[in-house]
C-alpha cells in the first residue's frame, strides 16, 4: 500500500451537487484518496493511491451520507510508466465491481479534447485536510479555484522535480492548494478534467509553491485503451 492520499487549503465547501463526478476512495471507512467517475464502471485516480481493495463513495458531497452509493472495487490498473520515485505518469484506473447508478448526483466527468492554456481558472476539489501540517478532515467536499501555471514558470520553482506530463496550478502569494487526502481528485477547467491531484510541497499551502497535477489531456488515449482492454 502506498502513502496515504495527498492533498484543500484555503478553500470553501463546494456548491451542493456541483461535482457529481467526484468520488472518494476509502480504505474501510477511512478516506484514502479522491477520484473521478469516467463511466459507470471506471474511476480515474492517481497511481500513488493504489491499494489492494477500494470502497468507492459516490453521489454525495458528504462522506458518511447513508444515501451515497458505496461500491467495492478490487481491480486497478496503474499507468505502466508510473514511477514511485518521481511520480511521473501518476494516474490509475479503478474498475468498479458493480456499475454505478447515474443520477443528478452521479455523473461522468468530461475528459479533455485539448490541453487548457496557462492562466485558465480551474477548480480543485476533495475531502483532504484543510489544515497542514496538523490535519483537519472535513466531512463536506471542499473546493478552491486556482490558475494553470506554465511549465516554464513551474520549473523555476520545482526544477528537476517536474516532469513533462505534470501540470501546475496555484495562485501567486496564496496558500490555495490541495492537501493530504485530495490525491487523485479532479482539477476541472472549463467543464473538462485537466488534472488529477498528484503532489505538492509539505506542509501544504506554502505560498508560491504550486500544486502539481497529472495532466489528463496527455493520457486520454491510454485511459480509453485501458478501459477497452479490461472490459
Amino acid at each position: 500500500e502506498e502513502a496515504q492520499g495527498d492533498k484543500i487549503i484555503d478553500g470553501a465547501p463546494c456548491a451542493r451537487g456541483s461535482h457529481p463526478w467526484q468520488v472518494a476512495l476509502l480504505s474501510g471507512n477511512q478516506l484514502h484518496c479522491g477520484g473521478v467517475l469516467v463511466n459507470e464502471r471506471w474511476v480515474l485516480t492517481a497511481a500513488h493511491c493504489k491499494m489492494n481493495e477500494y470502497t468507492v463513495h459516490l453521489g454525495s458531497d458528504t462522506l458518511g451520507d447513508r444515501r451515497a452509493q458505496r461500491i467495492k472495487a478490487s481491480k486497478s490498473f496503474r499507468h505502466p510508466g508510473y514511477s514511485t520515485q518521481t511520480h511521473v505518469n501518476d494516474l490509475m484506473l479503478v474498475k468498479l465491481n458493480s456499475q454505478a447508478r447515474l443520477s443528478s448526483m452521479v455523473k461522468k466527468v468530461r475528459l479533455p479534447s485539448r490541453c487548457e492554456p496557462p492562466g485558465t481558472t480551474c477548480t480543485v476539489s476533495g475531502w483532504g485536510t484543510t489544515t497542514s501540517p496538523d490535519v483537519t478532515f472535513p466531512s463536506d467536499l471542499m473546493c478552491v479555484d486556482v490558475k494553470l501555471i506554465s511549465p516554464q514558470d513551474c520549473t523555476k520553482v520545482y526544477k528537476d522535480l517536474l516532469e513533462n506530463s505534470m501540470l501546475c496550478a496555484g495562485i501567486p502569494d496564496s496558500k490555495k492548494n490541495a492537501c493530504n487526502g485530495d490525491s487523485g481528485g479532479p482539477l476541472v477547467c472549463r467543464g473538462t478534467l485537466q488534472g488529477l491531484v498528484s503532489w505538492g510541497t509539505f506542509p501544504c499551502g506554502q505560498p508560491n509553491d504550486p500544486g502539481v497535477y497529472t495532466q489528463v489531456c496527455k493520457f486520454t488515449k491510454w485511459i480509453n485503451d485501458t478501459m477497452k482492454k479490461h472490459r
Epitope: D6, Y158, K159, L161, G200, T201, P203, D209
Partner: antibody, heavy 122, light 107 residues
C-alpha cells in the same frame, strides 16, 4: 551533488545563544519541494529534529524547543541559520544541517552536513 | 508527537547473516517511514524511504517493509561494511521523530 556545511562556534557559555550557519552548494535553497532542517544528536544518543525552513520563509519547530529556536534563511547567500537561546549543558550535541525532500508524497532527508559539535560550558 | 520504538537496541551477527530490525509507531503513519545508516563520526545516510523504496545507489541487500504502525528493516546478508547504527524516522507528522537506533556489530 548538493553539499551542506555547518559553521559557528564550537563552545558556547550557559545562558547564551548558540548560533550556527549552514552554507549550501550544488543546489539552490530557493528550490520548491524541499525543506532546510536542523537536527541534533546528543553524545552517544539518538537524533532529534529541531526545525525546518522553506524557501517561502515558513518555519516549523519542534514543540520541545520552540520557545528557544529561530531558523532563518538568506537566499542571496544560499545559507540558512539556527539560533538557540538560553542554552544549558543539555544542549551539548552534534548539530547537523540537512536538506529534506518535503512533498505530500515523499518526505525524507537526502543530504546532510558533516555535523559540528557544540559544547555548552563555562 | 509520534513516538517511534525501535528494537533491538543492539545486535551482534555473523557476516552473511540475515539481520532484521523492527520499528513501531505510536499511531498510524501510513508508509511515511524512512531508514538511515550512521557510521561512527559520520552523518546519517538515507537507505530506505516510504517504508520500502531503496534510495539510489544503496545495495539491494537492504530492504524495508510495513505500513501503518509496524515496520521492518532487513539486511539480507550482513557485510563487514554494514557495521553501523540504524535509525527509523517517521515523516507523517511534524515534528519528525526518530527511533532510538539499533547498533549492529559483527560477531
Amino acid at each position: 551533488q548538493v553539499q551542506l556545511q555547518e559553521s559557528g562556534p564550537g563552545l558556547v557559555k550557559p545562558s547564551q545563544t548558540l548560533s550556527l550557519t549552514c552554507t549550501v552548494s550544488g543546489g539552490s535553497i530557493s528550490s520548491g519541494g524541499y525543506s532546510w532542517n536542523w537536527i541534533r544528536q546528543h553524545p552517544g544518543k539518538g537524533l532529534e529534529w529541531i526545525g525546518s525552513i522553506y524557501r517561502s520563509g515558513s518555519t516549523y519547530y519542534n514543540p520541545s524547543l520552540k520557545s528557544r529556536v529561530t531558523i532563518s534563511v538568506d537566499t542571496s547567500k544560499n545559507q540558512f541559520s539556527l539560533k538557540l537561546s538560553s542554552v544549558t549543558a543539555a544542549d551539548t550535541a552534534v548539530y547537523y544541517c540537512a536538506r529534506a525532500k518535503a512533498l505530500t508524497t515523499h518526505r525524507y532527508v537526502d543530504y546532510w552536513g558533516q555535523g559540528t559539535l557544540v559544547t555548552v560550558s563555562s | 508527537d509520534i513516538q517511534m520504538t525501535q528494537s533491538p537496541s543492539s545486535l551482534s551477527a555473523s557476516v552473511g547473516d540475515r539481520v532484521t530490525i523492527t520499528c513501531q509507531a505510536s499511531q498510524d503513519i501510513a508508509n511515511y517511514l524512512n531508514w538511515y545508516q550512521q557510521k561512527p563520526g559520520k552523518a546519517p545516510k538515507l537507505l530506505i524511504y516510504d517504508a520500502s523504496n531503496l534510495e539510489t545507489g544503496v545495495p539491494s541487500r537492504f530492504s524495508g517493509s510495513g505500513s501503518g504502525t509496524d515496520f521492518t528493516f532487513t539486511i539480507s546478508s550482513l557485510q563487514p561494511e554494514d557495521i553501523a547504527t540504524y535509525y527509523c524516522q517517521q515523516a507523517r507528522d511534524l515534528p519528525f521523530t526518530f527511533g532510538g537506533g539499533t547498533k549492529v556489530e559483527i560477531k
